[in-house]
Amino acid sequence: IFLSAFFTYVPMNEQIIIGRLGEDIILPSSFERGSEVVIHWKYQDSYNSYNVHSYYKGSGRLESQDTRYANRTSLFYNEIQNGNASLFFRRLSLLDEGIYTCYVGTAIQAITNKVVLKVGVFLTPMMKYEKRNTNSFLICNVLSVYPRPIITWKMDNTPISENNMQETGSLGPFSINSTLNITGSNSSYECTIENSLLKQTWTGRWTMKDGLHKMQSEHVSLSCELVNDYFSPNQDFKVTWSRMESGISSILAYYLSSSQNTTFYESRFSWNKELKNQSDFSMNLTDLSLSDSGEYLCNISSDEYTLLTIHTVHVEPSQETASDN
């Protein structure tokens, strides 16, 4: 087969670069090395072109640089002679999104590269369980996200749509609360928040365990296991055990996988097993009293997941106590 060396060219060379809010990024541009190099990085919006960074006659020229880029851009000056015209861009803001054009001129070549910069943010979301009077709610919350995420709920692995969404931040980043009323339900719930730009997904899973009926002075074992489907082996996570009382949560124990440190806030609380395999975070609560009745919440959280397990404990008076009265 004869392959012709005849080409039709697309105008410019275009690349999409994705950065994160507040972080640094490199906008790439390369050229065949040459002498007397001229480099101009420009930002183009619908109305205007702004000078981002210029280099010619052997040095950076920032006299005409737009103020929004002051102290935030630089070139790799010692690599220019090797054909590197990439721009180092500090502290990205959402306003930096858009089209950047890098023009490079040498004695033998002219090159125009186009870079489309997109900026995203995805602060780790949270799943919260709240009781308001006699109602129970699950809240999926992301404090700072851009662009708008896709939020989906499932009940017993079946997608559902009835949720109440609240959003603040008109242009972004957005703060989003998605609330689901789960009063009287024994189902398991899952909330997924997806940032399609950053290709990041977070999942919150809530499970209500069967009620536990115990006698005073007995002990109770509260199960909480890390599901391998959710957590990868090297992922840092934290485990928090807390008790819900009149809508207020008080922490009983706290564990950090990175340091493998546990802090107990209740002396009667202890791990069921040694945390050798770091997957079973079941707890023992000893010497139960009537006031220990209530809801116990295990929260296992990483950057990508939150697993909430709820136990309802009913402590009843023992026979002796009952006959004494």
Epitope: F7, Y9, V10, P11, M12, N13, E32, G34, E36, V38, H40, S54, Y56, K57, R61, E63, S64, Y103, G105, T106, A107, I108, Q109, A110, I111, T112
Partner: antibody, heavy 116, light 107 residues
């Protein structure tokens, strides 16, 4: 020595398209950018755009975007300009010129006459 | 786009005279200016680039100067063969732009 040999004069009807060539010799074709410049009778020079044979892309002056298409054939060391939807405004001499930011060698020019 | 303005369309001079052709850019072009000579019926020829660097084979009677927005091509002692159209061009950034040209006539 460096030479840029351009195709013969063209006579075209309004609305038609034309393709002119520029054959390079005496240097490595892919090393240099090829520019195209327009000159109307008794007027100054207008930069149309460039094509980068080694990289495989081009850049155009806004005015000529859509009007002109630049291509190359590396096997024959030839650059081409195609002009579409011709009008009398396109009647001019078209030069190819080798260079980076300045144009050190020029073709002899191709005269395009658009007339009904 | 950067606009290059050559205020004199024509300049008249005598052989042996010193002549200066000017060119003004609409913004600072950082000495990235080239000058071309175009004789009747011919294609342009590069004389200078980076405002003052002579291209190979260009006689030293041609000199260039300037910075910022104002640039000058000077012919120290005009010869009869210098009768031509002179173009300035900014090679600072694309789209490259040319001045309207200055025609040098011999009296």
């Amino acid at each position: 020595q460096v030479q840029l040999q351009q195709s013969a004069a063209e006579l075209a009807r309004p609305g038609a398209s034309v393709k002119m060539s520029c054959k390079a010799s005496g240097y490595t074709f892919t090393t240099y950018t090829m520019h195209w410049v327009k000159q109307r009778p008794g007027q100054g020079l207008e930069w149309i755009g460039y094509i980068n044979p080694s990289r495989g892309y081009s850049d155009y002056s806004q005015k000529f975007q859509g009007k002109s298409t630049l291509t190359t054939d590396k096997s024959s060391n030839t650059a081409y300009i195609q002009l579409t939807s011709l009008t009398s405004e396109d009647s001019a001499v078209y030069f190819c010129a080798r260079g980076g930011y300045d144009f050190d060698y020029w073709g002899q020019g191709t005269t395009l006459t658009v007339s009904s | 786009d950067i606009v290059m303005t050559q205020s004199h369309k024509f300049m008249s001079t005598s052989v042996g005279d010193r002549v200066s052709i000017t060119c003004k850019a609409s913004q600072d072009v950082g000495t990235a200016v080239a000058w071309y000579q175009q004789k009747p019926g011919q294609s342009p020829k590069l004389l200078l680039y980076w405002a003052s660097t002579r291209h190979t084979g260009v006689p030293d009677r041609f000199t260039g100067s300037g910075s910022g927005t104002d640039y000058t091509l000077t012919i120290s002692s005009v010869q009869a063969e210098d009768l031509a159209l002179y173009h300035c061009q900014q090679h600072f950034i694309t789209p490259y732009t040319f001045g309207g040209g200055t025609k040098l006539e011999i009296k």
